[in-house]
């Protein structure tokens, strides 16, 4: 029998410096460009090799991000979120969210982590 | 998964003019960066023109600038690569590729490495 597929969902905040090259990643999303339906949020595409956000470590393909130094995420053209990015300074502190994936037992059981019994 | 498929390639004469087609399928086709690249027998893959999601932003190299023009129609998930006055040291296999992000830095539209997903290419060859 199949197990059951459900999400945690859990925040973080990931302080980066800006590295040489920038903070190393990549972004989809926006109220002009969704990317998951129903959901305007800005989602990270691609951790690049040997970049900031790499060698923290932290942030994963994946996370959406809901603010960037405090400033929220939501309702932004692309584009606006991109520059937002690109002009956040030295230092930043992005607000993000992981969905962790967590296969549970068969139906019919009881799995680990699943309350509903 | 994204696939690519070019189409349009062929034998033309120099000075000539050739239209490009990269059909894409997967995910969805508006929010890919899209870039057009050639490999020349003997040579390495070289950038010829990138285009963003949107189509508001072109970049083309020194060698194809004011002869070539590329574009996009999202609405039937298509790039193209309009070839005018082609030249013999046109001649090459060209590759349309795509990413699915925008950079949060500058980057490099020009890099290979910086595309996730390639077609298998499309031959032209001016004599």
């Known amino acids: 029998m199949n197990g059951r597929v459900d999400y945690l969902v859990t925040e973080e905040e990931i302080n980066l410096t800006r590295g040489p090259s920038g903070l190393g990643f990549n972004i989809v999303g926006g109220t002009d460009q969704q990317y998951v339906s129903n959901d305007s949020g800005i989602y990270v595409s691609r951790i690049k090799e040997n970049g900031a956000a790499a060698l923290d470590g932290r942030l994963q393909e994946g996370d959406k991000i809901l603010s960037v130094n405090g400033q929220d995420l939501k309702n932004l053209l692309h584009q606006d979120a991109v520059d937002l990015f690109r002009n956040a300074g030295y230092a930043v502190s992005l607000r993000v969210q992981h969905r962790l994936q967590v296969q549970n037992g068969p139906i019919g059981h009881r799995g680990e982590g699943d309350p509903s019994g | 998964q994204v696939q690519l498929v070019e189409s349009g390639g062929g034998l033309v004469q120099a000075g000539g003019s050739l239209r490009l087609s990269c059909a894409a399928s997967?995910?969805?086709?508006?929010?890919?960066?899209m870039g057009w690249f050639r490999q020349a027998p003997g040579k390495e893959r070289e950038f010829a023109a990138h285009i963003n999601w949107s189509g508001g932003s072109t970049n083309y190299a020194d060698s194809v600038k004011g002869r070539f023009t590329i574009s996009r129609d999202n609405a039937k998930n298509t790039m193209y690569l309009q070839m005018n006055s082609l030249k013999p040291e046109d001649t090459a296999v060209y590759y349309c590729?795509?990413?699915?992000?925008?950079?949060?830095?500058?980057?490099?539209?020009?890099?290979?490495?910086?595309?996730?997903?390639w077609g298998q290419g499309t031959q032209v060859t001016v004599s």
């Open positions: 997967g995910r969805t086709f508006s929010t890919y960066t």
């Open positions: 590729a795509a990413a699915i992000w925008s950079s949060v830095d500058s980057y490099d539209h020009s890099d290979p490495l910086e595309y996730d997903y």
